[in-house]
């Protein structure tokens, strides 16, 4: 089932997705799409990275994190009710059927009646758990020609992830409300 995240109309929404690049030079291609992850690729692609860059994006969708260090979390600017729905983060690990697929549900709530001035990157998010694929411990290593070696394992809890991460600082600095549960 999808993990749910929330934002208010007019704010920026944040959908977390992480992995750990195994080698500095070669990132793993990642795609973000609107709609649940299909068998291959992403449907309705809104943003895509390759081995080094963000190489495709559409208006309002961008990566604000250290994407070259594996933080491929998606920011959606100035959301509307139409942005509600399922989003797919797909980490395209070389090899057959090796992709990590995450479905994240974004719920947009109407803005409060008395709007407070919002700062850039303000958002309110519910984080039941953090979706990560980080190299902590044993995992199968896939190698394909000149593509990068990937060493990936999953970690599930937000608390562990936030304890010493930049994200915690970013969230605090942006005035965000974090709910864990």
């Amino acid at each position: 089932s999808e993990v749910e995240y929330r934002a208010e109309v007019g704010q920026n929404a944040y959908l977390p997705c992480f992995y750990t690049p195994a080698a500095p030079g070669n990132l793993v291609p990642v795609c973000w799409g609107k709609g649940a992850c299909p068998v291959f690729e992403c449907g309705n692609v809104v943003l895509r990275t390759d081995e080094r860059d963000v190489n495709y994006w559409t208006s309002r969708y961008w990566l604000n994190g250290d994407f070259r260090k594996g933080d491929v979390s998606l920011t959606i600017e100035n959301v509307t009710l139409a942005d509600s729905g399922i989003y797919c983060c797909r980490i395209q690990i070389p090899g057959i059927m090796n992709d990590e697929k995450f479905n994240l549900k974004l719920v947009i709530k109407p803005a409060k009646v008395t709007p407070a001035p919002t700062r850039q990157r303000d958002f309110t998010a519910a984080f039941p758990r953090m979706l990560t694929t980080r190299g902590h411990g044993p995992a199968e290593t896939q190698t394909l020609g000149s593509l990068p070696d990937i060493n990936l394992t999953q970690i599930s809890t937000l608390a562990n992830e936030l304890r010493d991460s930049r994200l915690a600082n970013d969230l605090r600095d942006s005035g965000a409300t974090i709910r864990i549960g």
Epitope: P24, G25, N26, D53, V54, W62, N64, S146
Partner: antibody, heavy 120, light 107 residues
Framework: QVQLVQSGAEVKKPGASVKVSCKAS????????MDWVRQAPGQGLEWLGY????????SYNQKFKGRVTMTTDKSTSTAYMELRSLRSDDTAVYYC?????????????WGQGTTVTVSS | DIVMTQSQKFMSTSVGDRVSITCKAS??????VAWYQQKPGQSPKLLIY???NRYTGVPDRFTGSGSGTDFTLTISNMQSEDLADYFC?????????FGGGTKLEIK
Amino acid sequence: QVQLVQSGAEVKKPGASVKVSCKASGYTFTDYYMDWVRQAPGQGLEWLGYIYPNNGGTSYNQKFKGRVTMTTDKSTSTAYMELRSLRSDDTAVYYCARGGYYSYYSYDYWGQGTTVTVSS
Amino acid sequence: DIVMTQSQKFMSTSVGDRVSITCKASQSVGNNVAWYQQKPGQSPKLLIYYASNRYTGVPDRFTGSGSGTDFTLTISNMQSEDLADYFCQQHYSSPYTFGGGTKLEIK
């Protein structure tokens, strides 16, 4: 210490090709991207493309696609940038620059520059 | 292509001044911006990477700030050796693009 040493100045006629070399030392050549940037006289900086010596992967600025080729020789830790069908507005100083992963692919080391003059 | 705009081509300054050079991206580039210093006849030198990280050996009077589309390089205590051209660059998406440069001059 890290050094990028480029080949000497070139004078070319319109329509000709030029191949600039960049010899790297002081680091593991295959661990870092090599980008190429040029600067026309009195102008700003313009990115031509990059090559990843580890696997030969390249990405070129669309503006130069079909005219530029980047290669490396791992045995000599040397990167090459060839520009074909030269025009007068290709007159510029051409730099190789190391794309540092830990500096988010900004350029932590630059070559001294190679002046390419295109004139009939 | 993402356009990086440095609106001030020249800035007059005096030793000891606080100088702020601005750079605006045509669309969000996160924090993927670098600042370079270039003196006449020399190659550019990296000052700031990832918008606010001072590169090794760069004096702490140089500070970078900003995120998204608006970025600033600040020199807190201008020195004569800081007279140079300054370029911003986005490395979020290729083609990587540079601002047109800002030249610091003495008043």
